[in-house]
């Protein structure tokens, strides 16, 4: 039985050219997290964090994606095309998979303030 919940940074905004932290957190379960996958809105795979093997950043994103903090992901040199949904998928044992959603809006405005908060989707 899957008892856990994924908390995410929810809807966030960041400046074009800047960076943003994508963060998910699995709570309310004792399941063992074996892997966390990060995907972009167009089905592109950004990165994987495996409990045994560490981080794998996909070649297409090596220049713009930094692992962490924790199981999260830092997306750098933001462009307007980065606007959209991002998904974290937690592979756990014995529960199975949990999935969280974050919506990122990249803003042109130089006065745009980075906003982030944890919420349960």
């Amino acid at each position: 039985m899957m008892t856990g919940t994924i908390e995410t940074t929810g809807n966030i905004s960041a400046k074009k050219g800047g960076s943003v932290i994508l963060q998910c957190h699995l709570s309310s379960t004792m399941a063992q997290v074996t892997q966390v996958n990060w995907e972009q809105h167009d089905h592109s795979l950004l990165a994987i964090r495996n409990a045994e093997l560490g981080w794998h950043i996909y070649p297409a994103f090596k220049d713009r994606v930094a692992p962490g903090p924790g199981l999260g992901l830092t997306l750098q040199s933001l462009t307007m095309n980065d606007t959209g949904e991002y998904f974290c998928t937690y592979h756990t044992y014995p529960d199975g998979t949990y999935r969280g959603r974050i919506f990122l809006e990249v803003l042109e405005s130089s006065v745009a303030e980075h906003s982030a908060r944890f919420q349960i989707p």
Epitope: N37, L45, I48, N50, H56, H91, Y93
Partner: antibody, heavy 120, light 108 residues
Framework: QVQLVQSGAEVKKPGASVKVSCKAS????????ISWVRQAPGQGLEWMGW????????NYAQKLQGRVTMTTDTSTSTAYMELRSLRSDDTAVYYC?????????????WGQGTLVTVSS | AIQLTQSPSSLSASVGDRVTITCRAS??????LNWYQQKPGKAPKLLIY???SLQSGVPSRFSGSGSGTDFTLTISSLQPEDFATYYC??????????FGQGTRLEIK
């Protein structure tokens, strides 16, 4: 270099069991899983299941549930696949393959294959 | 289980040709699609993982693309050693990994 060396060919009668071994070397055995894939003569590839060498977690193909058991011996870096109640359509080459990343980045190293023939 | 359908099932081509093999999934598998090459009597060899990432040591004439349900393996300029059978594999559903039926690439 990474190597997976499998046990030799087997001939079995219907209803019998077979146990194929896969000895790994050249990497940290417990950091990866081992997947098993079989290929009947002239046919395509069929995934049989996976075992984590770290904690022994297993996933088996639904059609083989109850007939297959996968195990590992971390002291010898060896994985085993046992298939019971053999039938003629189990005749195939059985491959072990290294599978990290919860199998999601593909199987990057393979054993040489073990031919299992089931015949009365 | 997720079904993968490859096309064509077989094709003939000449050295130097550009060849494209497609793989269609019965449901969206994001980019969890891998490609393998297999020669007679040998184990499969991983060419492309995650739809478009080239496996270490694989020549750059091999490339992959696609996401969702439609994927493509392209060989930009066929070499004599490329004649083999090619399989796609989905790793989206790790509880039930499946392969395509294979595409046999023959010398014309």
């Amino acid at each position: 270099q990474v190597q997976l060396v499998q046990s030799g060919a087997e001939v079995k009668k219907p209803g019998a069991s077979v146990k194929v071994s896969c000895k790994a070397s050249g990497y940290t055995f417990t950091s990866y899983g081992i997947s098993w894939v079989r290929q009947a003569p002239g046919q395509g590839l069929e995934w049989m299941g996976w075992i984590s060498a770290y904690n022994g977690n297993t996933n088996y193909a639904q059609k083989l549930q109850g007939r297959v058991t996968m195990t590992t011996d971390t002291s010898t870096s060896t994985a085993y696949m046992e298939l019971r109640s053999l039938r003629s359509d189990d005749t195939a080459v059985y491959y072990c393959a290294r599978a990290g990343w919860e199998q999601q980045l593909g199987f990057d190293y393979w054993g040489q294959g073990t031919l299992v023939t089931v015949s009365s | 289980a997720i079904q993968l359908t490859q096309s064509p099932s077989s094709l003939s081509a000449s050295v130097g040709d550009r060849v494209t093999i497609t793989c269609r999934a019965s449901q969206s598998i994001s980019s969890y699609l891998n490609w393998y090459q297999q020669k007679p009597g040998k184990a499969p060899k991983l060419l492309i993982y995650a739809a478009s990432s080239l496996q270490s040591g694989v020549p750059s004439r091999f490339s992959g693309s696609g996401s969702g349900t439609d994927f493509t393996l392209t060989i930009s300029s066929l070499q004599p050693e490329d004649f083999a059978t090619y399989y796609c594999q989905q790793s989206y559903s790790t509880l039930a990994i499946t392969f395509g039926q294979g595409t046999r690439l023959e010398i014309k």
